[in-house]
């Protein structure tokens, strides 16, 4: 922390301007009034403060607003946002998308994923739900940021908004997030025709249950291997060789390369070797011919 000193009369600050770049840290601490700083935050980003000087300005704001900054200050943080921790951001209440845009622009090119994720979370909380305007802002200014939201926050996305989500926005989504988004996407695209539906639903399929994957296998979709590899293991394991063949179409030839990777490896272990051989790829590891498969889990459930 900066030690307290009194401000020399000639250094007294009446407005935030470029002259402050010549102030030492302790002079800034002593001479800049926090309320003045907050009122003139819109000027701060235009002044080439050092990171050390920004630390002092942040300290001033923290003292003035121990419960979290008001949005009027947050909107104009500019490069001061780079000094914020997720803990600082958690105290904020942000509702304006202009504020979100401004801070997303500042964070670009900096390692701030935790801060950005917290900021987006605060925006969703502040606005009450993840509405279309928020999704549009995220996809435009922060591709991939949608996946930084928790499954709980994503559950506030209305299905009508799903159409605004692009495939690349889902690249970093984990299984739990796709579990939340998939049923919404299914609902949003339910009135589309087969091929159009598949194109739209494809990025969300990492959250699809077995029944839906089986249904797709009956629709001549020719699922590409990258999409197949992103399906839930639990959704893939119950599929038969014939269903996988129909689901992938010509893409089934790519299974050979993925033979050792999940979910293909786990799926192979559950198939009869005879059936795997029909794929013509030399896939190995299936259940040998003549072996009887006992599903003990069924017996346990009955007893």
């Amino acid at each position: 922390d900066v030690e307290r000193t009194t401000c020399p009369p000639e250094k007294e600050v009446h407005e935030i301007d470029e002259s402050l770049i010549f102030y030492k840290k302790r002079e800034l601490e002593a001479c800049v009034d926090a309320a003045l700083l907050a009122a003139q935050m819109d000027r701060v980003d235009a002044i080439p403060f050092t990171y050390e000087q920004l630390d002092v300005l942040k300290h001033k704001l923290d003292e003035l607003y121990p419960q979290g900054y008001p949005e009027s200050v947050i909107r104009h943080l500019g490069h001061l946002f780079l000094k914020m921790s997720p803990e600082d951001i958690r105290k904020w209440n942000v509702t304006s998308l202009e504020t979100l845009k401004a801070l997303l622009k500042v964070s670009k090119g900096h390692e701030m994923s935790a801060q950005v994720a917290t900021l987006i979370d605060r925006v969703v909380v502040g606005r009450g739900q993840l509405d279309k305007d928020t999704v549009d802002t995220l996809t435009a200014f922060c591709p991939g940021c949608l996946c930084s939201l928790s499954p709980e926050r994503l559950s506030s996305v209305p299905p009508s908004v799903i159409g605004a989500v692009r495939p690349q926005d889902l690249d970093t989504c984990g299984p739990r997030q796709l579990d939340v988004l998939y049923p919404k996407a299914r609902l949003a695209f339910q009135n589309m025709s087969g091929s159009e539906y598949f194109v739209k639903i494809r990025p969300f399929l990492g959250g699809a249950p077995t029944e839906d994957v089986k249904a797709l296998s009956q629709q001549n979709v020719s699922m590409d291997l990258a999409t197949f590899m992103k399906l839930r293991r639990e959704a893939v394991l119950p599929l038969t060789v014939a269903e996988v063949q129909k689901l992938l179409g010509p893409h089934v030839e790519g299974l050979k390369v993925e033979e050792q990777h999940s979910p293909v490896r786990d799926w192979i272990l559950k198939q009869r070797q005879d059936d795997l051989d029909t794929l013509g790829l030399g896939l190995q590891g299936g259940i040998p011919n003549g072996y009887l498969i006992l599903d003990l889990s069924v017996r346990e459930a009955l007893s």
Epitope: P250, H251, V252, E253, G254, K256, V257, T278, L279
Partner: antibody
Framework: QVQLQQPGTELVKPGASVKLSCKAS????????MHWVKQRPGQGLEWIGN????????YYNERFRSKATLTVDKSSSTAYMQLSSLTSEDSAVYYC??????????????WGQGTTLTVSS | DIQMTQSPSSLSASLGGKVTITCKAS??????IAWYQHKPGKGPRLLIH???ELQPGIPSRFSGNGSGRDYSFSISNLEPEDIATYYC?????????FGGGTKLEIK
């Protein structure tokens, strides 16, 4: 070693059909799909389609769907391509090729010598 | 389908020199490109796969590079036996596609 043997030439009349063969040896025939490629005189290579030799399931380049029919005979480790309603446009060298599944969908590491098909009356 | 645009369609170079051929894919092919040498009366010969991986037995005069949609193939220290037509092949999609070919001649 791996070999794909194709007859050198075929001469057929317009409107007729022809069945080109590709006999594989040196590897397990049913472990690799067989692909067919066309090259017209003075032109580039064009992928026609492929076939799963284990279940006989073919996939075609849309341009050749009504022209080519791919089949296999597992007992003789031979792949066939029948070309129907032949015209001068079908005069070309036809290659069979075997993929190596090293990455993605596999690149072709073994090729036949090609069969030169001439369609002429 | 993925289109592969290969250029130039023909080129002439001196013995000992270097030539470069390019292939542009109509979409990202994730480095899944192979390069072939083709001489009359023979099947194409695989030189390079996965953008830059040299096949066993292929001299290091042959090299490949690229990512995304743009790829290149080079031959340095040109030798008389390099006279051939060269093709790129994308195998990022099961429906494979070739470039139009580049005919290499020696000056």
């Amino acid at each position: 070693q791996v070999q794909l043997q194709q007859p050198g030439t075929e001469l057929v009349k317009p409107g007729a059909s022809v069945k080109l063969s590709c006999k594989a040896s040196g590897y397990t025939f049913t472990n690799y799909w067989m692909h067919w490629v066309k090259q017209r005189p003075g032109q580039g290579l064009e992928w026609i389609g492929n076939i799963n030799p284990s279940n006989g399931g073919p996939y075609y380049n849309e341009r050749f769907r009504s022209k080519a029919t791919l089949t296999v005979d597992k007992s003789s480790s031979t792949a066939y391509m029948q070309l129907s309603s032949l015209t001068s446009e079908d005069s070309a060298v036809y290659y069979c090729a075997r993929p190596y599944y090293g990455s993605s969908y596999g690149y072709f590491d073994y090729w036949g010598q090609g069969t030169t098909l001439t369609v002429s009356s | 389908d993925i289109q592969m645009t290969q250029s130039p369609s023909s080129l002439s170079a001196s013995l000992g020199g270097k030539v470069t051929i390019t292939c542009k894919a109509s979409q990202d092919i994730n480095k899944y490109i192979a390069w072939y040498q083709h001489k009359p009366g023979k099947g194409p010969r695989l030189l390079i796969h996965y953008t830059s991986e040299l096949q066993p037995g292929i001299p290091s005069r042959f090299s490949g590079n690229g990512s995304g949609r743009d790829y290149s193939f080079s031959i340095s220290n040109l030798e008389p036996e390099d006279i051939a037509t060269y093709y790129c092949l994308q195998y990022a999609n099961p429906l494979r596609t070739f470039g139009g070919g580049t005919k290499l001649e020696i000056k």
